[in-house]
Amino acid sequence: GITNINCSGHIWVEPATIFKMGMNISIYCQAAIKNCQPRKLHFYKNGIKERFQITRINKTTARLWYKNFLEPHASMYCTAECPKHFQETLICGKDISSGYPPDIPDEVTCVIYEYSGNMTCTWNAGKLTYIDTKYVVHVKSLETEEEQQYLTSSYINISTDSLQGGKKYLVWVQAANALGMEESKQLQIHLDDIVIPSAAVISRAETINATVPKTIIYWDSQTTIEKVSCEMRYKATTNQTWNVKEFDTNFTYVQQSEFYLEPNIKYVFQVRCQETGKRYWQPWSSLFFHKTPETVPQVTSKAFQHDTWNSGLTVASISTGHLTSDNRGDIG
């Protein structure tokens, strides 16, 4: 960067090189050029010459003032006009940064995705800091009192093999950058309570012609967890509100769920599951689209085959699911 240049003097910032966004700052330039009493000192920000708020302090030093500095990063350099020199002489350069101290991390969540071999911990980092911010995840066994720390820039995957201190842990997150440090509340976890079953996937859909046509959704999961509760949500693509059906599921075979839907309408389906009675849900599965027919022929939609446009008999029916707004979080 700009800091790798050979300097003939110094450039520095008050109160510091990295500072809180929105501050008023002063940038000083002091020339130390042999055989040069500078006629004029110039400041450049990102290669553009600054024309205002420059004060000459003495023969060798000038100050540039910025009010309410809002740029996350800027490259500053200053030059001198020396007598008998045709070009400006470079004095020095500096990369400056502005940002915010971290917020207190909240919504700390740790889950174990089945078969992953990892405990994944995430949190809400709060507002953007604009500067390099690191997070230390503390994991302390409630049985052995042993504490492990993991450094990361965002979330963390911790191998379950490294969690040797039993089943109960305290987890908390420290956020730190050059402007400050904050610590989350402690989250108490039991490893058996945070497992999320292997992802449930909708594989296909078919609408069977009957007196009242019905749509069957086929879905499955590779989970080995015995007691699993699932939700399937669906809506016409033109609607805002989801209908939700709940299931207690045994994944020893492919699930078939029946829906009585309006004809000639494009629907979207998603499914998610959790270990029965536990806290965390899977994220909703990817969107699965199915269009109901207008007339008699049977219509099948397969996963990733997003649309079916057959037309068939128009028969009105009402879903039995309850209504919910689309604001459920991914894992709880």
Epitope: T3, H10, W12, E14, P15, A16, T17, I18, F19, K20, M23, N24, I25, S26, Y28, Q30, T55, I57, N58, T61, R63, W65, K67, D95, D132, K134, A178, L179
Partner: antibody, heavy 117, light 107 residues
Framework: QVQLVQSGAEVKKPGSSVKVSCKAS????????ISWVRQAPGQGLEWMGW????????NYAQKFQGRVTITADESTSTAYMELSSLRSEDTAVYYC??????????WGQGTLVTVSS | DIQMTQSPSSLSASVGDRVTITCRAS??????LNWYQQKPGKAPKLLIY???SLQSGVPSRFSGSGSGTDFTLTISSLQPEDFATYYC?????????FGQGTKVEIK
């Protein structure tokens, strides 16, 4: 030659406030910022905050936020540091310092503040 | 906040010895590091600024080096007047922070 001259020693009761002054001479007072640094007996140096005299901009260490107020009077070339809600741990020598290069190249002689009941 | 860690916390040396004091920052601070000397009952005195620039009037036996997180103050040949406590200080971000100090004593 720049000189920073601080006010004299103070003895204060816990819960009270102290205001230390720092008068600059021999240079343009408003050209550079003034920082306040304290040193408890037998301990290291601790930065408390900074003021840009000409602009009135301040920046305080979080540890002192809400208890310290740094001000400057350009007309008398004097900076002030007021610390409130004093406790015994605030017993220290308080220095004002100014940097005309990166770092503090001019320091006041220090003001001993003793907090005792 | 950026933590500054000096080592050693104290050392004994003789006149003429070469003395090295190190300072480590808890995160990269570029070259925004200054070194001070303090004698009992006196205000600190700036020796080195911007990691390696010798302050005007300071003897050339003092030198500084380093960038990023690791910095060194070297006294090439210790003189009787150099027995004092030395502090590093970062000016990269507020709060400005100092190392805990290194006391150089006579052996």
């Amino acid at each position: 030659q720049v000189q920073l001259v601080q006010s004299g020693a103070e003895v204060k009761k816990p819960g009270s406030s102290v205001k230390v002054s720092c008068k600059a001479s021999g240079g343009t007072f408003s050209s550079y910022g003034i920082s306040w640094v304290r040193q408890a007996p037998g301990q290291g140096l601790e930065w408390m905050g900074w003021i840009s005299a000409i602009f009135g901009t301040t920046n305080y260490a979080q540890k002192f936020q809400g208890r310290v107020t740094i001000t400057a009077d350009e007309s008398t070339s004097t900076a002030y540091m007021e610390l409130s809600s004093l406790r015994s741990e605030d017993t220290a020598v308080y220095y004002c310092a100014r940097g005309t290069v990166p770092g503090f190249d001019y320091w006041g002689q220090g003001t001993l503040v003793t907090v005792s009941s | 906040d950026i933590q500054m860690t000096q080592s050693p916390s104290s050392l004994s040396a003789s006149v003429g010895d070469r003395v090295t004091i190190t300072c480590r920052a808890s995160q990269s601070i570029g070259e925004d590091l200054n070194w001070y000397q303090q004698k009992p009952g006196k205000a600190p005195k700036l020796l080195i600024y911007a990691a390696s620039s010798l302050q005007s009037g300071v003897p050339s036996r003092f030198s500084g080096s380093g960038s990023g997180t690791d910095f060194t103050l070297t006294i090439s040949s210790l003189q009787p007047e150099d027995f004092a406590t030395y502090y590093c200080q970062q000016s990269y971000s507020t709060p400005l922070t100092f190392g805990q100090g290194t006391k150089v004593e006579i052996k």
